[in-house]
Interface confidence: low
């Protein structure tokens, strides 16, 4: 009977523990369901945010393209409405740019070409007057687009046209032969012949945009 | 003894059930911890996405403003005639003319005024860079619109505004007193103080015409 009582007591304890555990499991199950629900909500939230982010990226990309197009148009239009680009001098029918670096004749020619221009070409005494005045405050030489292969060749402009003899007299190394040819520079209003491999400033020239505004 | 056996059997069952439940609880606990961890990761993910979205929104806003500005500028520029007169250099918002004659400061000022301009005013390091580059091939001095009555007075631009001290250091005759005042000239990129009565080249400046016509 004593054993029996002890067993009954243990049984009661175990039943109590079992019920308690079942309760805990039930509670955990509910919590788990809630957690699962919350996790699903979070996943949904992530999906929404990821979608929004993707949309924003698309919009941004679109805006960026718009922006680039506008900048491109602006460049075009700015150059359309202005006779000459920024930093160039507009004179009569031409735009002139005085280089800010010293290079040999060929490199100077390349620099002008990259700006959709050519080295200076003097067509008239009026052109010469303007250039002489524009460089009057410089003691440095400026390459122009005039060169010849050697003294037995004629002086030619970049476009292949010959130099008009009445325009100016070329001084300096006119009878010298150089492997890279002889090129003309203008300095303090006078034009000189020199070895094309030497470094000098240069003057680029292109047609001014004088279409109806 | 029969009761005892029955109780023992029930006890064994209960113990078995209890162990099973405890195992379940343990498993659920682990699952819960894993779920918690996963939830934390999801929350972190959400935070990151939300931050990215916010950044994207800011960038987009900025791009949007840039776009509006570009559109505005485009409208303005599209209706522009030449930003600067012939022989002037257009740079950013201004037109610059490098004089072809040497005069004292006052006479230089008059010459600029007659062209509806003022002597050079440098507002920023960008302005200074442009001017330094533009005169890089000259070794001559150019008057700018900066002067002072004597060393106890501040350096003032023609419009009365003071010189920003960080822009450049003025060299030369800074502590000298001249009856005609002290004026500033720029030469080979550096700014010097000199007697205003001396003759030098000069740089005129006026606003570029970028308004809608």
């Amino acid at each position: 009977s004593q054993v029996s009582n002890l067993l009954k007591q243990q049984q009661t304890n175990l039943t109590h523990q079992k019920n308690k555990l079942e309760g805990q499991i039930s509670a955990r199950q509910q919590a788990e369901e809630a957690s699962q629900e919350s996790q699903n909500e979070l996943k949904e939230m992530i999906e929404t945010l990821a979608w929004k982010l993707n949309e924003k990226s698309k919009e941004q990309m679109e805006l960026h393209h718009q922006n680039l197009n506008l900048q491109e148009t602006l460049k075009r239009v700015a150059n359309c409405s202005a006779p000459c680009p920024q930093d160039w001098i507009w004179h009569e029918e031409n735009c002139y740019l005085f280089s800010t670096g010293s290079f040999n004749w060929e490199k100077s020619q390349e620099k002008c070409l990259s700006l959709d221009a050519k080295l200076l070409k003097i067509n008239s005494t009026a052109d010469l007057d303007f250039i002489q005045q524009a460089i009057s405050y410089s003691s440095f030489p400026f390459w122009m687009g005039l060169s010849r292969r050697n003294p037995s060749y004629p002086w030619l402009w970049e476009d292949g046209s010959p130099l008009m003899p009445h325009l100016f007299r070329i001084r300096g190394a006119v009878s010298q032969t150089y492997p890279s040819g002889t090129c003309a520079y203008i300095q303090r209003g006078a034009v000189y012949a020199e070895n094309c491999i030497l470094a000098a400033f240069s003057i680029c020239q292109k047609k001014a945009n004088l279409r109806a505004q | 003894s029969q009761v005892s056996n029955l109780l023992k059997q029930q006890q064994t069952n209960l113990t078995h059930q209890k162990n099973k439940l405890e195992g379940q609880i343990s498993a659920r606990q682990q699952a819960e911890e894993a779920s918690q961890e996963s939830q934390n990761e999801l929350k972190e993910m959400i935070e990151t996405l939300a931050w990215k979205l916010n950044e994207k929104s800011k960038e987009q806003m900025e791009l949007h403003h840039q776009n509006l500005n570009l559109q505005e500028t485009l409208k303005r520029v599209a209706n522009c005639s030449a930003p600067c007169p012939q022989d002037w250099i257009w740079h950013e918002e201004n037109c610059y003319l490098f004089s072809t004659g040497s005069f004292n400061w006052e006479k230089s000022q008059e010459k600029c005024l007659s062209l509806d301009a003022k002597l050079l005013k440098i507002n920023s390091t960008a302005d200074l860079d442009f001017i330094q580059q533009a005169i890089s091939y000259s070794s001559f001095p150019f008057w700018m619109g900066l002067s002072r009555r004597n060393p106890s007075y501040p350096w003032l631009w023609e419009d009365g505004s003071p010189l920003m001290p960080h822009l450049f250091r003025i060299r030369g005759a800074v502590s000298q007193t001249y009856p005609s005042g002290t004026c500033a000239y720029i030469q080979r990129g550096a700014v010097y103080a000199e007697n205003c009565i001396l003759a030098a080249f000069s740089i005129c400046q006026k606003k570029a015409n970028l308004r809608a016509q």
Partner: antibody, heavy 115, light 107 residues
Framework: QVQLVQSGAEVKKPGASVKVSCKAS????????VHWVRQAPGQGLEWMGA????????AYVQKFQGRVTMTRDTSISTAYMELSRLRSDDTAVYYC????????WGQGTLVTVSS | DIQMTQSPSSVSASVGDRVTITCRAS??????LVWYQQKPGKAPKLLIY???SLQSGVPSRFSGSGSGADYTLTISSLQPEDFATYYC?????????FGQGTKLEIK
């Protein structure tokens, strides 16, 4: 920074040739010509000629024409000056220098011509 | 060829003195003139180019002037490190010729 580093001293017999190198660094080699100047012991400076590394075009002083050759290897930014049919009066320090005016110079290479 | 003649060929001076070296070309060289300084066993160093432009890093006590065929190098106040040989060179027409040099010695 800009540097021109020349090859070491040479001792040659009359009639032989010498090739002096000049390695450039610190700037775009093809943008600036390289000049060669020599200085006999206790004497002044004498310009020999120049090469433009971009085009390979060279100009030589008349007195060296036919004896001097200036070349370059743009892949290693190096200019060369070769002087042939050496005579005892070619004994000198040979300098390479950049551009005109010559703003950077090599350290010089002593070429001794002696039998 | 253009001949370049420097004078004097040597000059003795003291620290603090003002020294002038002249260079005459056999024809006008349109300011295409440079001045170099050379110390024993060293390569020449560019001081002045385009007749009057000071090379960066060169002390302002050195100055150049002149036009046409006549040019001058001036050292306003001699410093111990200025004792050296000075050369002028024209770079208008090849061959680019040098003056024979002026040796500046301590008095």
């Amino acid at each position: 920074q800009v540097q021109l580093v020349q090859s070491g001293a040479e001792v040659k017999k009359p009639g032989a040739s010498v090739k002096v190198s000049c390695k450039a660094s610190g700037y775009t080699f093809t943008d600036y010509e390289v000049h060669w100047v020599r200085q006999a012991p206790g004497q002044g400076l004498e310009w020999m000629g120049a090469i433009h590394p971009g085009s390979g075009g060279a100009a030589y002083v008349q007195k060296f024409q036919g004896r001097v050759t200036m070349t370059r290897d743009t892949s290693i930014s190096t200019a060369y000056m070769e002087l042939s049919r050496l005579r005892s009066d070619d004994t000198a320090v040979y300098y390479c220098a950049r551009w005109l005016p010559m703003d950077y110079w090599g350290q010089g290479t002593l070429v001794t011509v002696s039998s | 060829d253009i001949q370049m003649t420097q004078s004097p060929s040597s000059v003795s001076a003291s620290v603090g003195d003002r020294v002038t070296i002249t260079c005459r070309a056999s024809q006008g060289i349109n300011n295409w003139l440079v001045w170099y300084q050379q110390k024993p066993g060293k390569a020449p160093k560019l001081l002045i180019y385009a007749a009057s432009s000071l090379q960066s890093g060169v002390p302002s006590r050195f100055s150049g002037s002149g036009s046409g065929a006549d040019y001058t190098l001036t050292i306003s106040s001699l410093q111990p490190e200025d004792f050296a040989t000075y050369y002028c060179q024209q770079y208008l027409i090849t061959p680019y010729t040098f003056g024979q040099g002026t040796k500046l010695e301590i008095k």
